[in-house]
């Protein structure tokens, strides 16, 4: 006996109670592929979640986080509290970065400032809680007799750098 369910398109389900007739998904449910025997319940964006895309008969709802939170996990499965730049989230809430570390985002952890001298560079601008150090020229470039000429043009142009 031919399986009539394979003819049921997305947005419908194969209703065994009605001789394998394709029935539309009920409200607040969806089927994203054809041939489904059931429709899936739509995700509800509640609490710290807000709706980014409404559920339709063929696709699930998509959630974002409300202001002050950011998404974590696949398909924004969790919301985590934002902190300010210069802070990181701990079990006790947002804490300022320790001296010598920075965080330039509202999420993530504080990272150590770059150690310019390890890379053979001098410090141009000191780091802050919100920003990494900017390294400057190498000490060799600063010695007497060093050329002040700009280095030769790079092989390819760099990408955009934050300002």
């Amino acid at each position: 006996l031919q399986d009539l369910c394979s003819n049921c398109p997305a947005g419908t389900f194969c209703d065994n109670n009605r001789s394998q007739i394709c029935s539309p998904c009920p409200p607040n449910s969806f089927s994203s592929a054809g041939g489904q025997r059931t429709c899936d319940i739509c995700r509800q964006c509640k609490g710290v979640f807000k709706t980014r895309k409404e559920c339709s008969s063929t696709s699930n709802a998509e959630c974002d986080c409300i202001s002050g939170y950011h998404c974590l996990g696949a398909e924004c499965s969790m919301c985590e509290q934002d902190c300010k730049q210069g802070q990181e989230l701990t079990k006790k809430g947002c804490k300022d970065c320790c001296f010598g570390t920075f965080n330039d985002q509202k999420r993530g952890i504080c990272r150590p400032w770059t150690n310019c001298s390890l890379d053979g560079k001098s410090v141009l601008v000191n780091g802050t809680k919100e920003r990494d150090v900017v390294c400057g020229p190498s000490p060799a470039d600063l010695s007497p007799g060093a050329s002040s000429a700009t280095p030769p043009a790079p092989a390819r142009e760099p990408g955009h750098s934050p300002q």
Epitope: T114, D119, T128, R131, C135, G136, E157, H160, S161, Q163
Partner: nanobody
């Protein structure tokens, strides 16, 4: 590429003021910080003052704190060094410097340091 051109140097008496300018052109969008270095004859080039182009945060060498002020006008792609109460020991060639990227290295390992050609400042009575 970034091009830097300094101007405003000259001969001035002790206690007087000068303002240096550094005009940047080319890929100025990539500059995250700029600075003024100076080099007296036979001496190492030293950092005088530096500035973050985005938020305007500044650093100064101890020897110029309270006398020199670094600033920038992003709309004109120009950095300035206002030098007040000049002393004979401020005599040097002053160089403009620009850096593209935080830390020491940049995207895909590119690193870029840019220098101007320098402008002479002589403080003498």
């Amino acid at each position: 590429q970034v091009q830097l051109v300094e101007s405003g140097g000259g001969v001035v008496q002790p206690g007087r003021s000068l303002r240096l300018s550094c005009a940047a052109s080319g890929s100025t969008f990539s500059i995250v910080a700029m600075g003024w270095y100076r080099q007296a004859p036979g001496k190492q080039r030293e950092l005088v003052a530096s500035i973050i182009t985005g938020d305007g945060d500044t650093n100064y060498a101890d020897s110029v704190k309270g006398r020199f002020t670094i600033s920038r006008d992003n709309s004109k792609n120009t950095m300035y060094l206002q030098m007040n109460s000049l002393k004979p020991e401020d005599t040097a060639v002053y160089y403009c410097y620009a850096r593209t990227g935080y830390g020491s290295s940049w995207l895909m390992g590119h690193e870029y340091d840019y220098w101007g050609q320098g402008t002479q400042v002589t403080v003498s009575s």
